[in-house]
């Protein structure tokens, strides 16, 4: 799950802390939704397999001018850095369906926390 | 206040070793990539290496093979392992925190000195 | 790689003058239609400091006289009115492929 760049090598799992505030983050956004996350925008579904982080803020970079993911956009980046390659992009974009960014964060919440309940951290 | 401190820097003969620190306050380390850039005296930036929050590696080919980067979240630390260095290593070396792709190096360190020379 | 290219590589100017810095690419460092350019101030004896992520969005605590534009290839630097703490040499930088790159620098001196 951890992206590869073209000059990456594969190494321990991310820390727990990195998801455990990556969750703490999706969490208040979910929470503190009033008005419709980020007026409605819709988004690309993903594949939450392998490349999930990746996969997770290639969807999101697209949501422009909403404060509220900001913040998940950037903690996403820390996953993944560097872009994956260009071979690996493809797999990432399976661009079939759309859905509102609540939809998208409330799913990619509730796999994190299977994730980390297995404490499956990468 | 975000703050990245780095040491570990010095005279090196060619072919010495040397290990860099990076010290990491006000933020929470683990959750961010990190990178070291370097400035040779008087020229301009290049990027050294990228550790992401899962320990992916990244490197540009100058320094493959003979450098590596590392991270210990628990003592809030980088690292900058420099193997084989030589003349053309000689530079101001930083440590920033890498937002990613998406968002550049957004806080640095003031950087230490490695200077290669017999 | 990707070579980037800055002009001029210096520039004089006063206080108060609009200040325009380019910066090419050696090939399109566009993705998904962002463009992957950052640009950093930084002063002599300094750490570098990123102003503008993605060509265009200014980091926050920037003052708001700096702005970035250009896609493709073709990217643009602006400081609307040159204030005297402005004096500093300013690096683009790519991050659509690795390696990550940076342009050799563009000084902005006092005239």
């Known amino acids: 799950l951890t992206c590869l760049g073209g000059f990456a090598s594969p190494g321990p799992v991310p820390p727990s802390t990195a998801l455990r505030e990556l969750i703490e983050e999706l969490v208040n956004i979910t929470q503190n939704q009033k008005a419709p996350l980020c007026n409605g925008s819709m988004v690309w579904s993903i594949n939450l397999t392998a490349g999930m982080y990746c996969a997770a803020l290639e969807s999101l970079i697209n949501v422009s001018g909403c404060s509220a993911i900001e913040k998940t956009q950037r903690m996403l980046s820390g996953f993944c850095p560097h872009k994956v390659s260009a071979g690996q992009f493809s797999s990432l974009h399976v661009r079939d369906t759309k859905i509102e960014v609540a939809q998208f964060v409330k799913d990619l919440l509730l796999h994190l926390k299977k994730l980390f309940r297995e404490g499956q951290f990468n | 206040e975000v703050q990245l401190v780095e040491s570990g820097g010095g005279l090196v003969q060619p072919g010495g070793s040397l290990r860099l620190s990076c010290a990491a306050s006000g933020f929470t380390f683990s959750s961010y990539a990190m990178s070291w850039v370097r400035q040779a005296p008087g020229k301009g930036l290049e990027w050294v290496a990228s550790?992401?929050?899962?320990?992916?590696?990244y490197y540009p080919d100058s320094v493959k093979g003979r450098f590596t980067i590392s991270r210990d979240n628990a003592k809030n630390s980088l690292y900058l392992q420099m193997n084989s260095l030589r003349a053309e290593d000689t530079a101001v070396y930083y440590c920033?925190?890498?937002?990613?792709?998406?968002?550049?190096?957004?806080?640095w360190g003031r950087g230490t000195l490695v200077t290669v020379s017999s | 790689d990707i070579q980037m290219t800055q002009s001029p590589s210096s520039l004089s100017a006063s206080v108060g003058d609009r200040v325009t810095i380019t910066c090419r690419a050696s090939q399109s460092v566009d993705h998904f239609g962002w463009s992957l350019v950052h640009w950093y101030q930084q002063k002599p004896g300094k750490a570098p400091k990123l102003l503008i992520y993605?060509?265009?969005n200014l980091e926050s605590g920037v003052p708001s006289r700096f702005s970035g534009s250009g896609s493709g290839t073709d990217f643009t630097l602006t400081i609307s009115s040159l204030q005297p703490e402005d004096f500093a040499t300013y690096y683009c930088?790519?991050?659509?492929?690795?390696?990550?790159?940076f342009g050799g620098g563009t000084k902005v001196e006092i005239k």
């Open positions: 920033a925190r890498n937002e990613g792709y998406y968002f550049g190096l957004t806080q």
């Open positions: 550790i992401s929050t899962g320990d992916t590696t």
């Open positions: 993605r060509a265009s």
């Open positions: 930088q790519q991050s659509n492929e690795d390696p990550w790159t």
